[in-house]
């Protein structure tokens, strides 16, 4: 397993939420993306093949979620001070083989420009 | 212990019919693709299609020898594999292999022991 | 559809000897490319997949290289069960087996 912090701006903001960037090698054609706040798994991706390169996508833990040829973006919304932790994009890579876990992530901090409802 | 067994094989006139079958045990049937392998008598291995997981809708792919003519279906409810095969030529003798393989998370790769089909008038 | 060739179509060798066969694809297929061993009268038996990565209990004297259309098996010393006959097959689109290749004891 390699860990490592994102060497990319993984969190943007917009209208109240934060979209999470999770990016991985294009070459990688098969993987599991999950999104994990501390140890718990918020979201999750699946990409598999089928024989007629036709192509799978599940997700068990389901969140708004938006795939590239090289990232998986997961969103969260209506944000507030309780977001504000350790993210952990968690990479399991099938294809190609071998079989190999990449853990990257960052803190998410919360600032009050960035919440969705501010009290005036 | 993985096991593929093969049944159904036989002699068959040239334009006959014959339904292989292919009972999977010791490992997850409905995660793996699964194909059917022929090998004509002192011949080289020959694809001949597949059906995918359900994850893909079973869909079936063949190679072009026997497009139209044969068709791959499964039973995940009772681990089995088929293999209907229509006008039947003389060219279709061969021991037929059920395979399993899946590539996620690992790569795996099981093979059954064959079952002779002979094509003869 | 992707066609594969294979050489040479037989070959002998004594024990101890390195051994290499080729396997040509009509078009690129990355490295989707695996090796099969098959003893007379037995089912085919999974050596290396993915060009270069050996197959559970496979033993070391057995490798692969190559990339995209252009492949090579190798054993690094030939041993009297290695033999076989020994097909490359891909699996970039479906799967294709080439005609094989048979090894015997000089």
């Known amino acids: 397993e390699i860990n490592g912090s994102a060497n990319y701006e993984m969190f943007i903001f917009h209208n109240g939420g934060v979209q999470i960037l999770c990016k991985y090698p294009d070459i990688v054609q098969q993987f599991k993306m999950q999104l994990l706040k501390g140890g718990q798994i918020l979201c999750d991706l699946t990409k598999t093949k089928g024989s007629g390169n036709t192509v799978s996508i599940k997700s068990l833990k389901f969140c708004h979620s938006q795939l590239s040829n090289n990232s998986v973006s997961f969103f969260l919304y209506n944000l507030d001070h309780s977001h504000a932790n350790y993210y952990f994009c968690n990479l399991s890579i099938f294809d190609p083989p071998p079989f190999k876990v990449t853990l990257t992530g960052g803190y998410l901090h919360i600032y009050e420009s960035q919440l969705c409802c501010q009290l005036k | 212990e993985v096991q593929l067994v093969e049944s159904g094989g036989g002699l068959v006139k040239p334009g006959g019919s014959l339904r292989l079958s292919c009972a999977a045990s010791g490992f997850t049937f409905s995660d793996y693709f699964m194909h059917w392998v022929r090998q004509a008598p002192g011949k080289g291995l020959e694809w001949v299609g597949v059906?995918?997981?359900?994850?893909?809708?079973?869909?079936?792919y063949y190679s072009d020898l026997v497009k139209g003519r044969f068709t791959i279906s499964r039973d995940d409810s009772k681990n089995t594999l088929y293999l209907q095969m229509n006008s039947l030529k003389t060219e279709d003798t061969a021991v037929y292999y059920c395979?399993?393989?899946?590539?996620?998370?690992?790569?795996?790769?099981?093979w059954g022991q064959g079952t002779l089909v002979t094509v003869s008038s | 559809d992707i066609q594969m060739t294979q050489s040479p179509s037989s070959l002998s060798a004594s024990v101890g000897d390195r051994v290499t066969i080729t396997c040509q694809a009509s078009?690129?297929?990355?490295?989707?490319l695996s090796w099969y061993q098959q003893k007379p009268g037995k089912a085919p038996k999974l050596l290396i997949y993915y060009t270069n990565l050996l197959a559970e209990g496979v033993p070391s004297r057995f490798s692969g290289s190559g990339s995209g259309t252009d492949f090579t098996f190798t054993i690094s010393s030939l041993q009297p069960e290695d033999i076989a006959t020994y097909y490359c097959q891909q699996y970039y689109n479906y799967r294709t087996f080439g005609p094989g290749t048979k090894v015997d004891i000089k």
């Open positions: 078009q690129d297929i990355s490295n989707y």
């Open positions: 395979t399993a393989t899946i590539a996620v998370p690992y790569y795996f790769d099981y």
């Open positions: 059906i995918d997981t359900k994850s893909f809708n079973y869909a079936t």
